[in-house]
Structures are given as C-alpha cells and as structure tokens.
C-alpha cells in the first residue's frame, strides 16, 4: 500500500529519549531477535537471551495535533532504526548516521504512533496509518492491520 500523504506532510521534531534498552515481547511471549543479515527482525522463543534485541524509544513532536505520541524505535547501541515498508512487508532496519532531529516527507516511514492501553503497547505506522508493527509465530516482524497477526507488545 502507498504511504498516506496526510501524515507524510507533517514535520516530526526530535524531543527526547524516553525509554532505553527495553525488550519487546508479543502476546505469545516471543522475543524479537535480529536476523543474520542484520536488516530484519524476527520472533521466536529464545533460550539465548543475549540474542534478544533491546530497543531505545525517541519521542517526537509533530507541531500539529498533539493527540498522538510519535516515536522512533532504534536498536540499542547501534544506529539501526525500525522502518515501515508496507502491508505484510517486514520492517526494515535502516542505518542512519545519527538520530534524526527532523523527520519529514518520505522519511516518515521511521515514525510510529505509540499507544499504551490495557497494559499493552501498540505501534501504528505514520506512513501507513492503517498498519501496526506486528508479529506471527516464528516469523519476521512486519506491518499488518491486525489478526491473524499479533499487534500488541509487552515492554520490559
């Protein structure tokens, strides 16, 4: 699906680092790990917890309607940022020279709207507003509308 232009027209300005070195588990309690090629994320039940990915979350302000919480997700101790590619497409890890201070236009594939409800965390893509960061059993982290994919995460 093509990126949604309304959100893409917004300018997202870096506010602050709001969460550091946290782990995300899906509703099957799968952990997220980095694929061998380092460009993608996958889920499984890990025995070796050293493989599990730790994330940093950066808050942004849109300057427009402040009713949402725009964030970027970065792999801790790296410059790899989670990026949206479209429906049923795996999220891509983009290497950036630094944490973006301003995100506009086509770069909004880096922005996700974070919402915590029911003790669960959801991430909707700014570029594809109908899609959530999602998981399935032992498969790549991707974007989906909902079931059969799982769209909620526990953060710890």
């Amino acid at each position: 699906s093509a990126p949604y232009t309304y959100q893409s027209d917004l300018r997202y300005k870096l506010m602050k680092l709001v969460r550091q070195k946290f782990v995300m588990n899906d509703s099957l309690n799968q952990t997220i790990y980095q694929d061998v090629d380092k460009h993608y994320l996958s889920t499984t039940w890990l025995n070796d917890l050293q493989q599990e990915v730790k994330f940093d979350m950066y808050a942004y302000s849109s300057g427009g309607d402040d009713s949402k919480y725009p964030v970027t997700l970065k792999i801790s101790d790296s410059q790899l940022f989670v990026s949206a590619q479209g429906e049923d497409q795996p999220v891509l890890l983009k290497e950036l020279p630094e944490t973006p201070k301003l995100i506009t236009g086509s770069e909004t594939d880096l922005i996700f709207f974070w919402k915590s409800i029911n003790s669960k965390n959801y991430f909707t893509s700014a570029a594809y507003p109908e899609l959530f960061i999602a998981t399935k059993e032992q498969s790549r982290v991707h974007l989906a509308r909902g079931l059969p994919s799982m769209t909620d995460f526990q953060i710890s």
């Epitope: 506010m15 602050k16 009713s67 974070w114 919402k115 915590s116 409800i117």
Partner: antibody
C-alpha cells in the same frame, strides 16, 4: 492499580468560576505518554470531552470551550485541576476525569449551576 | 471537529437477540475508535479499543469492527445485564468526540 477521583463545589451560581480537582494514583504525569482527560455529561445526555493535560505539559482543549478553560497540574501530589470561568446553567453536569486513553474513569462529581 | 453519528438512539430487544450499533465519522479516523458501556448511575466503561480490540475482562459477545469512517458494535447474544447506554468515541484527533449514545432496553 489506577484510581481517579474528582472533587468539586457541588453547587455554584451563574458567572462564577468552577474549580475541579482530579486526584489520581497508579501512574505519574511525568512519564511520557501519560495524560488526564476531563469529560462531562449533562443529566440524561451524552458525553462531551473538554480537555487533556499530559506529560511534557501537553495540553489539548475542546475549541468550543477553550476561551473559558484553564488546565493545570500538581505532579508531585498527583493532581490535575480544571477551571471553567463564567459558568451558566448549561455547564451543569457530572464531570469525570479519566486517564489518557480513557480506560480508567473516576466516579464523577455532580455540578449544578443555579441562581 | 470530527462528528460521530451514532445510530440508533434507542433499542428495545429481548434477551438472546443480536444487536448492532453503527457509528459514522465525518472524516476518516483510521482505527482510532473506542466503544463504551455506561450502566445507570455509573461512569463509562471501556469495552472495545482500536475499533476491534476487546478490553480485558469484556465478554466475547461484544465485538467491534470497521475502519476509516464506518464502525459497527455488535452484541451477539444480549443478556439482561447488558441494559446500558453505549457510546462510540474517536481519539484520532483533538477534540476527541463521542457519538450521541444508544440506549439499550430489555423487553
């Protein structure tokens, strides 16, 4: 466990200022992504969202009432305050506070504006 | 402001009936719609969020669906304790707005 509780004057006269307090526990407004909403409901009628105050002093207002509303907070005491100036009988309602995503609500406080 | 038009206003049903309430947004609100139940003399209680996600502890007879501008809330088999007013609400953009409510009465 998240708990919210509203308190207010009960009865006041037209043209006065309504002052309401929402005392809450189980979360902190200094945490990114948290907020408190104010919603009101005239007796037997629907729900009207009034305003929201959140972390980083984010404030959202219903434009219909923005000129009359003031929002403030006391983060250390986990309290949020709503002031509505120049009240009229149409401001008579049950006033609720709820957390940011409106999954937890207080029991409400009844406000009557009468001369 | 986004207007949420909720229909019907009243529903008189028998226990065991299937009930459907609709909400139409004046512009797209993506999936940012919640449904609340308000029992007499109580504060609203969240049943459904993100249009179709059931809140913890909510019986599976309550379901929600929709995206964009058209949303549906269904009670598959109404029970006597479902006597309440039901509201839809959008939190896509400020000011957040509610539908006018549907009063469910049991015959």
């Amino acid at each position: 466990q998240v708990i919210l509780k509203e308190s207010g004057p009960g009865i006041l006269q037209p043209s006065q200022t309504l002052s309401l307090t929402c005392s809450f526990s189980g979360f902190s407004l200094s945490t990114y992504g948290t907020a408190v909403n104010w919603i009101r409901q005239p007796s037997g009628k629907g729900l009207e969202w009034l305003a929201q105050i959140g972390s980083d002093d984010r404030k959202l207002y219903n434009p219909f009432l923005k000129s009359r509303i003031t929002l403030s907070e006391d983060t250390s005491n986990s309290q949020v305050f709503l002031k509505i100036t120049s009240v009229d009988t149409e401001d008579s309602a049950t006033y609720y506070c709820a957390n940011g995503v409106m999954e937890y609500w207080g029991l409400g406080t009844s406000v009557t504006v009468s001369s | 402001s986004i207007v949420m038009t909720q229909t019907p206003k009243f529903l008189l049903v028998s226990a065991g009936d299937r009930v459907t309430i609709t909400c139409k947004a004046s512009q797209s609100v993506n999936h940012d719609v919640a449904w609340y139940q308000q029992m007499p003399g109580q504060s609203p209680k969240l049943l459904i969020y993100f249009a179709s996600n059931r809140y913890t502890g909510v019986p599976d007879r309550f379901t929600g669906s929709g995206y964009g501008t058209d949303f549906t809330f269904t009670i598959s088999t109404v029970q006597a304790e479902d006597l309440a007013v039901y509201f839809c609400q959008q939190d896509y953009s400020s000011p957040y707005t509610f539908g006018g409510g549907t009063k469910l009465e049991i015959k």
